[in-house]
Interface confidence: low
């Protein structure tokens, strides 16, 4: 495994943001935006590639605009000064709805995916490799910007999963330390470890077509549901789960189970049909007393895309739906390592699985 | 029922090692994390240490970083914590206490350290 | 350090009366906070944990209660064996820390 050095997320950062690349665009980078849309009277948001913080040499702008019946604008601005625009005269961004905005860097242009669905391709102006700096501004609220590095190596597939393991360098954790990084919670600096960004095959027995691409970048059909895979690694204080996805229209319950053999050492479950977000844990096919209580209304709603965000640590599990925090749960199963397992089953449509 | 119950307390000498055991019963020592509380004569409540047994992470406090080392034996259901370079700071009695999913919610009775010469 | 400032240091309050006891976190630490209680000569009890929600067996007269980064205990109706002294405790950080204690006493 070579790990690499892909940097810590930015966690509900607030906007307008400009954060650095760690080490610049490289081919094969792939940029994962998370967010929400607001409702509120704005009309555009944007995501700036850039050179520096000042906003003159911005490499790739990508400009979502709900004006006009809605379409996106893409440029390259120089010096101060902006090229022509090319337009995509198609939404695929809805006010009030949460997102998952995905940037490929390739060596001949960004590819862009919207919810999983490959939307536009933006072909280089000038030399990506000057880029440091991603900014957002604009209508719009963000969970997390994530980094996924270039050098992947394949792992075997487990069930009917194409694991592609993404190394992510975090900080040695501090002993007895718990630092606050910007964003929902104060995430424990994790030891070197590895991410698998999980897609599904686009054909029985057929991978995609290059290993060394991050795989979310092509389209592809569902998630097989229910979709089961390891956590390489177990659980440990500082390990992130991400899973997005969208609530079919005619939900009645779905469910996340975090596994330790037989045991769910963490069952989630939204129930649509009680306006319930459950929380429990099985051990010995015998449930405990659930959790329900939540900070604010049911954050789950048919018909909508959404993102679960869940972050191990010592005490707890935390977690954020769509970038903000919901609620912790404290481990009843402590043996966190053997918390191997993840399931997830019920009436969603998984895009996009980071373990 | 669940039990903790400390032992190794005694007098020690400045600069001298100590070392505490917490034996617990009544419930699956690997699944919980066992913490040590002190707590000086007519003083408040002092965070020592803590051991995730099931993962082994350890975390101190600063005032015993260096000299205090926690640990556990699974197979004994005993955690452990071994006092070194004590001083006279360090005396109080010493509770070992059980974190399950919803805090510290069984303590042990106690142990008193005496830190003198 | 995540520092837990509680106060009062010490009451004095009668049977029937209602108490409340506050914590103020030097930083947000969530709703991971935990009261305990002690008699002399006796280890601490767990009455509330997660900032509100009531320990297994703990009379209902006992409360907790968060806002942002200040914490309350509350008695609703002080009984003679509820006389002890009172901690908070935070569980956000991994170096756990206490208040300093309130001492509720028989006026």
């Known amino acids: 495994m070579a790990f690499s050095g892909s940097q810590a997320p930015y966690l509900s950062p607030a906007v307008p943001f400009s954060g650095t690349i760690q080490g610049g665009l490289q081919d094969g980078l792939q940029i994962t935006v998370n967010g929400t849309v607001l409702s509120s009277s704005g009309t555009r948001f944007a995501v700036n590639f850039q050179t520096g913080f000042s906003g003159n040499d911005i490499a790739f702008h990508f400009n979502p605009r709900f004006e006009d019946g809605g379409y996106v604008v893409c440029n390259t601005r120089q010096n101060g000064s902006w090229g022509p625009e090319e337009r995509k005269t198609h939404m695929p961004f809805q006010k009030g709805m949460p997102f998952d905005l995905c940037f490929l860097v390739q060596s001949s242009d960004f590819k862009v995916m919207v919810n999983g669905i490959l939307f536009v391709q933006y072909f280089h102006r000038v030399p990506f490799h000057r880029v440091d700096t991603i900014s957002v501004n604009g209508s719009v609220q963000l969970s997390y910007i994530s980094f996924q590095n270039p050098r992947t190596v394949p792992v075997q597939p487990a069930f009917s999963t194409v694991p592609f393991s993404q190394p992510v360098c975090f900080p040695p954790r501090p002993r007895g330390r718990r630092q606050k990084p910007p964003g929902v919670w104060p995430a424990n600096p994790a030891p070197i470890t590895q991410t698998v960004i999980h897609t599904v095959q686009s054909a029985p027995g057929q991978m995609f077509s290059t290993p060394a691409i991050p795989p979310m970048m092509y389209p592809h059909p569902a998630y097989p549901m229910p979709f089961i895979t390891t956590i390489l690694g177990g659980l440990y204080p500082s390990k992130s789960i991400l899973l997005s996805g969208t609530v079919l229209p005619s939900a009645q319950r779905f469910h996340i189970n975090l596994c330790s053999g037989n045991h769910i050492a963490f069952h989630l479950n939204p129930r649509f049909d009680e306006n319930a977000v459950v929380r429990n844990t099985q051990i010995d096919n015998s449930w405990g007393s659930e959790e329900r209580s939540l900070p604010r209304k049911m954050p789950f709603v048919r018909g909508q895309s959404f993102s679960v965000w869940i972050l191990c640590e010592a005490h707890c599990l935390k977690v954020a739906v769509d970038g903000q925090h919901l609620f912790e749960y404290y481990h009843r199963l402590r043996n966190l390592p053997t918390i191997n397992r993840l399931e997830v089953g019920g009436d969603i449509q998984l895009t996009h699985v980071q373990t | 029922e669940v039990q903790l119950v400390e032992s190794g307390g005694g007098l020690v000498q400045p600069g001298g090692s100590l070392r505490l055991s917490c034996a617990a019963s009544g419930f699956t020592f690997s699944r919980y994390a066992i913490h040590w509380v002190r707590q000086a004569p007519g003083k408040g409540l002092e965070w020592v240490a803590a051991?995730?047994?099931?993962?082994?992470?350890?975390d101190y406090a600063d005032s015993v970083k260096g000299r205090f080392t926690i640990s556990a034996d699974t197979s004994k259901n005993t955690a452990y914590l071994q006092m070194n370079s004590l001083r006279a700071e360090d005396t109080a009695v010493y509770y070992c206490?059980?974190?399950?999913?919803?805090?510290?919610?069984?303590w042990g009775q106690g142990t008193l350290v005496t830190v003198s010469s | 350090d995540i520092q837990m400032t509680q106060s009062p240091s010490s009451l004095s309050a009668s049977v029937g009366d209602r108490v409340t006891i506050t914590c103020r976190a030097s930083q947000s630490v969530s709703s991971a906070v935990a009261w305990y209680q002690q008699k002399p000569g006796k280890a601490p009890k767990l009455l509330i944990y997660?900032?509100?929600s009531l320990y297994s067996g703990v009379p209902s007269r006992f409360s907790g209660s968060r806002s942002g980064t200040d914490f309350t205990l509350t008695i609703s109706s002080l009984q003679p064996e509820d006389f002890a002294t009172y901690y908070c405790q935070q569980s956000y950080s991994a170096l756990y820390t206490f208040g300093q204690g309130t001492k509720v006493e028989i006026k």
């Open positions: 051991i995730y047994s099931p993962t082994g992470y350890t």
């Open positions: 206490a059980r974190e399950g999913y919803i805090g510290m919610d069984y």
């Open positions: 997660s900032a509100s």
